[in-house]
């Protein structure tokens, strides 16, 4: 069994390449079923992952992917050179960066090669569908007896990013939220400092160079101030 | 974009329509072919791409097909086992380069 | 396949007045949406694709919005020669799917 597993951190297990194998048409044609809809998200500008549910088809099928980008010198059809599988069954191509042209179109085409006229195509904005990697480095510094400031560092164009910071003490029952632009700093202007406070950070690619939807995974948390868990139950939970 | 078509097809008869284009290479754009019954809405037939791989109309697949012929620039959509239901004006129209979608259209040929 | 639905089947309105068409679609489409006119006798025109981009050479009376399913067409300032059918229609993915169309009566 070869499974490919790409996560939004970079973190990649085993890889597979892929072997084009035909199976026997199906004596009941199946030219009208849908085909699968293909979900692409860019990793950062690093990758792209275009995948689709394989387990979908009324049996296991090899569908294939072709893509072409419109208006530009990379318009010429492209087959896929690295599929991903799951379960020996193709359900997904990666392409790496040199393959990747955030600002023209990209039509990626499945296709199941037992039944050639079933295929479907599918148009999308690539700078739409970038997901960058977690913000990295929180540092925290005090800029007043009161005052706060936490840095974080991405590893992409900073003003091509915009971010969320959450924050909470050891006796809040929620995150408070804080939206930041590309400038990658926030101020907590009044601190206590008889509290613990706990620190996160997501970006996505919005607004300048894209308009993603999807932020990035969270950083690793970071931490200020006393640390009074002994005294307050919400501490625990909170780090679990 | 201009369509030629036969006008007039008998019931269980096939359709055949040209569309001959200037101006732009079918090569470099997709043709898709699109049809208005009378005093009803648009439906989409189907779409040569400028790479030459087609996609159809999945209540149409079985009858429909489409190819062309570059040298010539034409393109060709052909229908088998029509039905009164068929009738209809048959547009074909441009796939933009950098316009995502279908920005000159035929004036259509009726198909009755 | 994808649905899109237009509600209204027709929309009445006078010259000067601003009216917005809408289109639903039956799933995420991305903001491939595309808007076009058809006047009695004519061809379809290009409006709107990308739910936003102004095709060439449309007046900037018209202006395209939405997200995720749901989508807008406004015309501002309603003129006499805008009386005609609108169709949306995605082009997210094959096949191709247009609205029922939308008839604006001045």
């Known amino acids: 069994l070869n499974t490919t597993i790409l996560t939004p951190n970079g973190n990649e297990d085993t890889t597979a390449d892929f072997f084009l194998t035909t199976m026997p048409t199906d004596s009941l044609s199946v030219s009208t079923l849908p085909l699968p809809e293909v979900q692409c998200f860019v990793f950062n500008v690093e990758y792209m992952n275009c995948t689709w549910n394989s387990s979908s088809e009324p049996q296991p099928t090899n569908l294939t992917l072709h893509y072409w980008y419109k208006n530009s010198d990379n318009d010429k059809v492209q087959k896929c050179s690295h599929y991903l599988f799951s379960e020996e069954i193709t359900s997904g191509c990666q392409l790496q960066k040199k393959e990747i042209h955030l600002y023209q179109t990209f039509v990626v085409q499945l296709q199941d090669p037992r039944e050639p006229r079933r295929q479907a195509t599918q148009m999308l904005k690539l700078q739409n569908l970038v997901i960058p990697w977690a913000p990295e480095n929180l540092t925290l510094h005090k800029l007043s007896e009161s005052q706060l400031e936490l840095n974080w560092n991405n590893r992409f164009l900073n003003h091509c990013l915009e971010h969320l910071v959450q924050y909470r003490t050891d006796w809040d029952h929620s995150w408070t939220e804080q939206s930041v632009d590309y400038r990658h700093k926030f101020s907590l202007p009044s601190v206590d400092g008889q509290k613990r406070y706990t620190f996160r950070v997501r970006s996505r690619f919005n607004p300048l160079c894209g308009s993603a939807q999807h932020w990035s995974e969270w950083s690793h948390p970071i931490h200020w101030g006393s640390n009074t868990s002994k005294e307050n139950p919400f501490l625990f939970a909170l780090e679990a | 974009l201009q369509e030629s078509g036969p006008g007039l097809v008998a019931p269980s008869q096939s359709l055949s329509i040209t569309c001959t284009v200037s101006g732009f290479s079918l090569t470099s754009y997709g043709v898709h072919w699109v049809r208005q019954p009378p005093g009803k809405g648009l439906e989409w037939l189907g779409v040569?791409?400028?790479?030459?791989?087609?996609n159809y109309n999945s209540a149409l697949m079985s009858r429909l097909n489409i190819n062309r012929d570059n040298s010539k620039s034409q393109i060709f959509l052909k229908m088998n086992s029509l039905q009164t239901d068929d009738t209809a004006i048959y547009y074909c129209?441009?796939?933009?380069?950098?316009?995502?979608?279908?920005?000159?259209w035929g004036q259509g040929t009726t198909v009755t | 396949d994808i649905v899109m639905t237009q509600s209204h089947k027709f929309m009445s309105t006078s010259v000067g007045d601003s009216i917005t068409i809408t289109c639903k679609a039956s799933q995420d489409v991305t903001t491939a949406v595309a808007w076009y006119q058809q006047k009695p006798g004519q061809s379809p025109k290009l409006l709107i694709y990308w739910a936003s981009t102004r095709h060439t050479g449309v007046p900037d009376r018209f202006t395209g919005s939405g997200s995720g399913t749901d989508y807008t067409l406004t015309i501002s300032s309603v003129q006499a020669e805008d009386l005609a059918l609108y169709y949306c229609?995605?082009?997210?993915?094959?096949?191709?799917?247009f609205g029922g169309g939308t008839k604006l009566e001045i």
């Open positions: 229609q995605q082009h997210y993915i094959t096949p191709w799917t």
């Open positions: 129209a441009r796939e933009g380069s950098t316009v995502d979608s279908m920005d000159y």
């Open positions: 040569i791409w400028a790479g030459g791989s087609t």
